[in-house]
Amino acid sequence: MKSGLWYFFLFCLRIKVLTGEINGSANYEMFIFHNGGVQILCKYPDIVQQFKMQLLKGGQILCDLTKTKGSGNTVSIKSLKFCHSQLSNNSVSFFLYNLDHSHANYYFCNLSIFDPPPFKVTLTGGYLHIYESQLCCQLKFWLPIGCAAFVVVCILGCILICWLTKKKYSSSVHDPNGEYMFMRAVNTAKKSRLTDVTL
């Protein structure tokens, strides 16, 4: 039950990007939310042929991808930190999964350009803000109330059913003259009513 609720809360997480708050902020959509994770897009110029791209979370290296060419122009792609990454002609995408509040931070794309020379390092980044959507907040507020109300209704229903069942059972089992007594009560009521009218 606990794990089910945990997955629900994770499902409710949404991602918002606040860029332009830091020097060297990305002038493109750096964070793309999909499949319960985030794709962090690190772009580099088309002319760059050999480079190292590091994904930094604050000052910590999360991911690392290096593309180089040997003396015979053979391409080598090396990943020091194991991350799910994707390389294209002008970008490296790093994928983060199972997001929670601890993922909220400044993320930087640290690009080291080896080729063409001169050697150059550029840093671009943005803030990955994880928040819970309004719908989920409402759901989280009303869900326990709804559940509690449902439980209360169920309990009351059970009590009512039990009470009715008990009443029926007691009246049929403990008083064999119940029908006769009922008739007597009716007759008595009729007599008193007639008396009232006469007076």
């Epitope: 015979g72 053979t74 063409p116």
Partner: antibody, heavy 117, light 111 residues
Framework: EVQLVESGGGLVQPGGSLRLSCAAS????????MDWVRQAPGKGLVWVSN????????NFAPSVKGRFTISRDNAKNTLYLQMNSLRAEDTAVYYC??????????WGQGTLVTVSS | DIVMTQSPDSLAVSLGERATINCKSS??????????LIWYQQKPGQPPKLLIF???TRQTGVPDRFSGSGSGTDFTLTISSLQAEDVAVYYC?????????FGPGTKVDIK
């Protein structure tokens, strides 16, 4: 300062074997492709072999393919060239060279390999 | 394999004069706007030294009297004013594809 120091050269008989080593210092060895280039006495430069950062990609000149193997130990900052079935035409100064992304920017002083009976 | 040829085999130039070395490749070395050609200098008893890469980009620390030009299959190394310390053999090399190959070299002497 980048330094490459070759060792292991010497005189060997045809058909024999030799293992060359290249000790690297002054740079992050694992960040670079490394190569072996040879030069026969009084002749020009001939590329022999190369290896990528972690040894996953290896290339050889057609003249040595199947006889030579290249390897590296990044923990020891050392490049190796294992030469088997040596021939007289393999006689040369063997240079260890760092491929600096777009050229051989650092070379060792070389080690002489002489194949003769 | 790409074959590299150089001309002349050797040349003698007076001190302060211009020296020109040519290099030709058997196929174009131009790709993505770059010419995959390198020039090295090798002095007697020494390993080669990088001079020029990408056909025309001078390596850091190389005197500006050395310049490279050309594109596609034809390339030139020029020493604008020859100095005594420039006496050496000069090699061109391509890195367009595997295997990378060197030219046979051009020996430069003082006249």
């Amino acid at each position: 300062e980048v330094q490459l120091v070759e060792s292991g050269g010497g005189l060997v008989q045809p058909g024999g074997s030799l293992r060359l080593s290249c000790a690297a210092s002054g740079f992050t060895f694992s960040d670079y492709w490394m190569d072996w280039v040879r030069q026969a006495p009084g002749k020009g430069l001939v590329w022999v072999s190369n290896i990528d950062h972690d040894g996953n990609i290896i290339n050889f000149a057609p003249s040595v393919k199947g006889r030579f193997t290249i390897s590296r130990d990044n923990a020891k900052n050392t490049l190796y060239l294992q030469m088997n079935s040596l021939r007289a035409e393999d006689t040369a100064v063997y240079y260890c060279a760092r491929w600096g992304h777009y050229a051989f920017d650092s070379w060792g002083q070389g080690t002489l390999v002489t194949v003769s009976s | 394999d790409i074959v590299m040829t150089q001309s002349p085999d050797s040349l003698a130039v007076s001190l302060g004069e211009r020296a020109t070395i040519n290099c030709k490749s058997s196929q174009s070395l131009l790709s993505s706007g770059y010419n995959y050609l390198i020039w090295y200098q090798q002095k007697p008893g020494q390993p080669p030294k990088l001079l020029i890469f990408y056909a025309s980009t001078r390596q850091t620390g190389v005197p500006d009297r050395f310049s490279g030009s050309g594109s596609g299959t034809d390339f030139t190394l020029t020493i604008s004013s020859l100095q005594a310390e420039d006496v050496a053999v000069y090699y061109c090399q391509h890195h367009y594809s595997s295997p990378p190959t060197f030219g046979p070299g051009t020996k430069v002497d003082i006249k």
